[in-house]
């Protein structure tokens, strides 16, 4: 069956060193346990996180994300997942694409992460 992928409609903000969550879901909602679900970074399609055959595929990750990501799957039975990225870096700023693949049918959604420096501030007046 066909579906749409829904991601955040507005940029997500995070501080360097913090963790950030990137939600993604399909609509209409349906069980995505058996689907391939992932995030990659355009334009070179570097894999941020990949879930396939019911488990996370750590070996496919780009080196800069290894050990820093976790797929929150409590609601995957409803087609809802969230990617958690720990220890956010300035290099994480920019576009991410989430996708769901069901056999040969794939849809995706783009989202944007804005990374800010927690120590940057402007002195008053």
């Amino acid at each position: 069956g066909q579906f749409r992928v829904i991601g955040p409609r507005h940029p997500i903000r995070a501080l360097v060193g913090d963790e950030v969550e990137l939600p993604c879901r399909i609509s209409p909602g349906k069980n995505a346990t058996g689907m391939e679900v992932g995030w990659y970074r355009p334009p070179f399609s570097r894999v941020v996180h990949l879930y396939r055959n019911g488990k996370d595929q750590d070996g496919d990750q780009a080196p800069e994300y290894r050990g820093r990501t976790e797929l929150l799957k409590d609601a995957i039975g409803e087609g809802k997942v969230t990617l958690r990225i720990r220890n956010v870096r300035f290099s994480d700023e920019g576009g991410f694409t989430c996708f769901f693949r069901d056999h040969s049918y794939q849809e995706e959604a783009a989202m944007e992460l804005k990374v800010e420096d927690p120590f940057y501030w402007v002195s008053p007046g």
Epitope: P8, R9, H10, I12, P23, P28, D74, A75, K80
Partner: antibody
């Protein structure tokens, strides 16, 4: 199945305070944003506030900002609304509502409690 | 804030009629729209989300369409249990806002 049970409503004088609670069951509470929506007698629905699954992010309607505080205790599967400086126009049935998912993609509401009536009057 | 305008505010219809309710957003909200049904003394019930996705367990006579600023809820063949008030809600941005409601009454 999802169950949401509100409590804490009642009669309070203008300027007074009240704390509403919502006990949740039947789903993984910490995975979903939660919200309060109110309905004045004979009127339409008005969104009040929402809180992320972790409790780290909150949003409020302008009409309650600075007076109401939403919070949650994921260990107790309970949502709260602390209401201070209450006004006559806050009189309404207050519904606890489970968000479809998170605060960024799913702030619509697929399960609702039965509501608790808050009456602000002297 | 995004203002949601529903029309009509009320309508009278008969069992078996096709009923259409419209909702207009004051600015574009993509497909971030939900429709609810509320009966007197009861909590609202989700019917449609993401403008056109049917909530699980909701009869297929309900359908939603639209994107951007103009949205429609259609009941293809009105049933006795459908007499209620219907609300749209945008969830594109905060504050979340509801339409004023459309009361569907028996003719």
């Amino acid at each position: 199945q999802v169950q949401l049970v509100e409590s804490g409503g009642g009669l309070v004088q203008p300027g007074g305070s009240l704390r509403l609670s919502c006990a949740a069951s039947g789903f993984t509470f910490s995975s979903y944003a939660m919200s309060w929506v109110r309905q004045a007698p004979g009127k339409g629905l008005e969104w009040v506030s929402v809180i992320s699954g972790s409790g780290g992010s909150t949003y409020y309607a302008d009409s309650v900002k600075g007076r109401f505080t939403i919070s949650r205790d994921n260990s107790k599967n309970t949502l709260y609304l602390q209401m201070n400086s209450l006004r006559a126009e806050d009189t309404a049935v207050y519904y606890c509502a489970k968000a479809y998912y998170d605060i960024l993609t799913g702030s619509l509401f697929d399960s609702w409690g039965q509501g608790t009536l808050v009456t602000v009057s002297s | 804030d995004i203002v949601m305008t529903q029309s009509p505010s009320s309508l009278s219809a008969s069992v078996g009629d096709r009923v259409t309710i419209t909702c207009r957003a004051s600015q574009g909200i993509s497909s971030a729209l939900a429709w609810y049904q509320q009966k007197p003394g009861k909590a609202p019930k989700l019917l449609i989300y993401d403008a056109s996705s049917l909530e699980s367990g909701v009869p297929s006579r309900f359908s939603g369409s639209g994107s951007g600023t103009d949205f429609t809820l259609t009941i293809s063949s009105l049933q006795p249990e459908d007499f209620a008030t219907y609300y749209c809600q945008q969830f594109n941005s905060y504050p979340l806002t509801f339409g004023g409601g459309t009361k569907v009454e028996i003719k």
